[in-house]
């Protein structure tokens, strides 16, 4: 794979180096100008010099104005203006916006569900195999094993909170110490960013729109990867947050409080309760390893039990196993004693789909995890389309001022951390990170949100789902309340020094420049989004949990070759971008290397070949039903093939962009093929009214 | 109803062995331990061991540990207990008893065989 | 073993009297004693188990308590068919034993 897409004919030069607006940022901001872009995205990038460590040269036909794909899209209103209206259109109007509304919240409504069933269809999937996950013994010496069965179970699961409750059971249990559930803890940050990545892959259809989209939810991931990748050896280290969350904990005399206010939880859970209940204790039993818990269905069946705790008589070895002197006896031959058991009487039977069906976990949740997508994607498409039809011209100006512009000087630098606090705040709210992350996928997407400002807002929503932990583990039974506090305190912490790394220097702020560089190649390479996806949730983890298992020896044996490759790939580019002249004229550039090593494009022919028959059949399906409808509904312009078909119009009509000028990027080293070619003010022609 | 019937007394010679029976009916034999009491002349009761008629485990007092065996025939619902290397002190008066399920109190008893032994 | 004492030995007494006997345990029995009730040339006779569960058919002027290591049993108004000998039995461990019994006679 290549270091970095089409490198292919960079020739650095050394003297000049130029990057468009919005590209990476300086030390020092021009807040002036992020208000400009905002406002005027139709203006022309202003070229600005940089130093040579931002940017790389790389050989393309360079347009007289460049679009740069990150300013935000004007909508424009193709509607006809308030002043101008009747009194009965004013009514139309203001009952048409009422009723979008209605819609807007409606479909938010199920998304969030939708949300909730996904998690519930990966626990059903994959939850037992998680829970397995947590009974290898091997996490108490191998932090590294630890963060990744982290970062699988909770991608699991669809639910760090459920990854989190298991460890502190765990740890309650004496299982597992607070040492060696702190990389848990860091993993399960990471799992818990896939929910939001998976939501942007629903706005593949729109080019400018999934460039945004997927950056935004990227800036998560990124986020959280790179802390752990300074975090995880720290904390190795030091310990730093295990002695600090103790000291607190120690430190104050917490008493029982009360549980975190669920305050969606109130509006979706009658929905989604008819759909599928779960019984998560199973999971955790089994992380326990509880054998009896393995045959169990993570499907509720009873809902109403009665629970009669009993005493009966059982035989023991010897009078050493009786619960105590005076509750044994003999019959003669046996010795007997007296045990409290617990017996559960089933009473009624919970109200959802699936309580009558018997089928096996694996078979309910592949169901829900099917129709969760398709009301994910709908809804998601639905709420695009209302919001794109009434955040339109003035509206929307007002809206993205708002939420995009600074504070005036010299307190500009605050804007940031009260949007830390507004993510904080809404996810407290939401009670769900993946929630409030996901939710804010689209409105990137659409552009009514900048990176820059979703990058804070992600951060708080990171620090909103401990403070919801932190709460729950003040409501823990006292035995449990200690180890789940502390484990809730680390997992705070760690965020603030997440946050502390990358986010006061705007320098610092790498995970807006990967994920905009993601972003681009996303764009051009829609198919490298769900490679991206599967590598970094998937395949490094379970390749380093392969190797953990197999030993120290192993897993150093191969991870020290593949970071010292990294690193030096690394350095070569860094010094490619920086003083080239200081290497030899091959290692210049990456020409030395095959194509299919420096360049996506011989792999984007390969996935090509692999998904043209099926794009080619969903196209003309698509067409046929186009046409039909637009004869029903007697309106020509009042549907239009997804994007997929016209950009593969496109490519039949072999377009192809030549090689010529100089020009680069706000990612590091990212090529203008890797930017895509499709303008961000692609209009479409579609009715506003829905 | 539950009965425990004993087989007749029994005079024999010290030295000797003696095996006595308790057949039983009104109950599921292999359900209940079969208690096996002795009563010496004038004395008090002394418990010599009992039986799983079930499974065929035995328990004995130390002190009869090696002189009594006790034995069962599901076929016919019957207990045994053989008392060998008889001397004088084991004059008595033997009960079956059936133990109560799930501990030692001895809810039946047969009326009991008396065993002297006399040269 | 565990021991039991039974006292008294003897115990003379009339028709319509209240009676009681105790049996003391060398160690802890917790409630795993039983009480019966034997005539001269008949087989004993189960009146209380567990301390204080009168066996089926037992008339309710028997009544047993105590747990531990002091039992006792109550006859709450002596009828003429209650003078026998009484004998008190733990099952808390093997082997099994019995007090060395009471003998209830008509005064």
């Known amino acids: 794979m290549a270091p970095w897409p089409e490198l292919g004919d960079a020739q650095p030069n050394p003297d000049k180096y130029l990057e468009g607006a919005a590209g990476q940022q300086p030390t020092a901001p021009d807040k002036s100008k992020e208000t400009n872009k905002t406002d005027n995205t139709e203006a022309p990038v202003t070229k600005i010099e940089l130093l040579p460590s931002y940017s790389t040269a790389t050989l393309i036909d360079e347009p007289t104005e460049v679009d740069d794909p990150w300013n935000l899209p004007t909508l424009q209103d193709s509607g006809i203006k308030w002043s101008e209206r009747d009194t009965k259109g004013k009514i139309l109007c203001f009952f048409q916006g009422i009723g979008r509304l209605i819609l807007l919240l409606g479909f938010l409504y199920f998304f969030v569900c939708s949300l909730d069933i996904l998690s519930s269809a990966f626990q059903l999937v994959g939850g037992k195999m998680a829970g397995q996950f947590f009974s290898n013994s091997s996490i108490m010496s191998n932090p590294l094993l630890g963060l990744v069965i982290g970062v699988l179970v909770t991608v699991l699961v669809q639910s760090s909170s459920t990854s989190t409750s298991i460890v502190v059971s765990m740890v309650s249990s004496s299982l597992l110490t607070v040492r060696a559930a702190i990389p848990i803890i860091m993993g399960a940050n990471i799992g818990t960013s896939i929910t939001n990545t998976i939501v942007a892959l629903m706005q593949v259809g729109d080019r400018s729109e999934f460039r945004r989209a997927f950056a935004g939810a990227t800036v998560h991931d990124f986020f959280n990867w790179l802390s752990v990748l300074v975090l995880l050896p720290v904390e190795v280290a030091t310990h730093y947050l295990e002695i600090i969350t103790q000291l607190i904990v120690e430190s104050f005399h917490f008493k029982n409080g009360e549980d975190a206010p669920d305050l969606l939880k109130v509006i979706t859970k009658p929905f989604t309760k008819l759909i599928v209940q779960l019984d998560k204790k199973v999971i955790s039993q089994i992380a326990m390893n509880d054998e009896k818990a393995k045959n169990k269905s993570l499907v509720k069946i009873w809902c109403k039990t009665f629970t009669n705790k009993t005493q009966i008589n059982v035989t023991v070895p010897s009078t050493a196993n009786c619960t105590s002197p005076s509750l044994c006896w003999t019959d003669g031959i046996q010795n007997w004693t007296m045990k409290n058991v617990t017996y559960k009487e089933n009473i009624a039977k919970c109200q959802h789909i699936f309580v009558n069906f018997h089928l096996p976990d694996l078979a309910v949740g592949t169901i829900l995890l099917i129709l969760s997508l398709l009301v994910l994607c709908g809804c998601l498409i639905m709420i695009v389309k209302i919001l794109g039809s009434v955040l339109k011209g003035q509206v929307a100006t007002v809206i993205k001022k708002t939420i995009n512009t600074d504070f005036p000087f010299p307190f500009a630098w605050l804007t940031g951390y009260l949007a830390i606090l507004v993510g904080a705040g809404m996810t407290f709210i939401v009670q769900s990170s993946s929630v409030f992350t996901s939710a804010l996928t689209p409105l990137i997407g659409i552009g009514v949100i900048t990176i820059e400002r979703a990058y804070p807002l992600t951060l708080g929503s990171n620090i909103g789902t401990t403070t919801t932990a932190i709460l729950a583990a003040l409501a823990s039974p006292g035995n449990a309340l200690r180890s789940s506090l502390q484990i809730a305190l680390c997992h705070f912490f760690f965020n603030i020094s997440g946050i502390l790394l990358w986010y006061p220097i705007p320098f610092t702020r790498l995970p807006i420049r990967m994920a905009k560089g993601l972003g681009n190649i996303s764009a051009k390479y829609r198919w490298f989004a769900v490679f991206y996806l599967i590598i970094f949730f998937f395949l490094i983890p379970l390749t380093v949990f392969g190797l953990s298992l197999a030993g120290w020896r192993v897993l150093v044996g191969v991870g020290v070759p593949v970071v010292f490759i990294i690193i030096l790939v690394l350095c070569l580019r860094l010094l490619q971008s920086r003083c080239p002249r200081v290497l030899p004229k091959k290692l210049q550039n990456w020409n030395f290397l095959p194509l299919w090593m420096r360049s996506l494009k011989p792999w984007d022919a390969v996935v090509s070949k692999f998904t043209g028959c099926f794009q080619m059949r969903c196209c003309c399906c698509c067409r046929v039903c186009c046409r039909a409808c637009c004869l029903l509904c007697d309106c020509p312009k009042c549907c239009r093939c997804s994007k997929c078909c016209e950009d593969l119009e496109e490519a039949q009509e072999g377009q192809d962009v030549p090689v010529k000028a100089p020009e680069t990027f706000d990612n590091i080293t990212i090529s203008r093929e890797a930017q895509g070619e499709v303008p961000a003010s692609d209009s479409k022609t579609e009715c506003t009214a829905l | 109803q539950v009965q425990l019937v004993q087989s007749g007394a029994e005079v024999v010679k010290p030295g000797a062995s003696v095996k006595m029976s308790c057949k039983t009916s009104?109950?599921?034999?292999?359900?209940?331990?079969m208690h096996w009491v002795k009563q010496a002349p004038g004395q008090g009761l002394e418990w010599i061991g009992a039986?799983?008629?079930?499974?065929?485990?035995?328990a004995y007092n130390q002190k009869f540990k090696g002189r009594a065996t006790l034995t069962a025939d599901k076929s016919t619902s019957t207990a045994y207990m053989e008392l060998s290397s008889l001397r004088s002190e084991a004059t008595a008066v033997y009960y079956c008893?059936?133990?109560?399920?799930?501990?030692?109190?001895?809810?039946?008893w047969g009326q009991g065989t008396s065993v002297t032994v006399s040269s | 073993d565990i021991q039991l004492t039974q006292s008294p030995s003897f115990l003379s007494a009339s028709v319509g009297d209240r009676v009681t006997i105790t049996c003391k345990a060398s160690?802890?029995?917790?409630?795993?004693v039983a009480w019966y009730q034997q005539k001269p040339g008949k087989a004993p006779k189960l009146l209380i188990y567990?301390?204080?569960t009168r066996h089926s058919g037992v008339p309710s002027r028997f009544s047993g308590s105590g747990s531990g290591t002091e039992f006792t049993l109550t006859i709450s108004s002596l009828q003429p068919e209650d003078f026998a000998t009484y004998y008190c039995?733990?099952?808390?461990?093997?082997?099994?034993?019995f007090g060395q019994g009471t003998k209830l006679e008509i005064k």
């Open positions: 008893a059936r133990g109560m399920y799930g501990h030692g109190a001895m809810d039946y």
């Open positions: 009104g109950y599921t034999f292999t359900t209940n331990n």
């Open positions: 039986i799983y008629p079930g499974s065929g485990a035995t």
């Open positions: 160690q802890d029995v917790g409630t795993a």
């Open positions: 567990w301390a204080t």
């Open positions: 039995q733990q099952y808390s461990s093997n082997p099994l034993t």
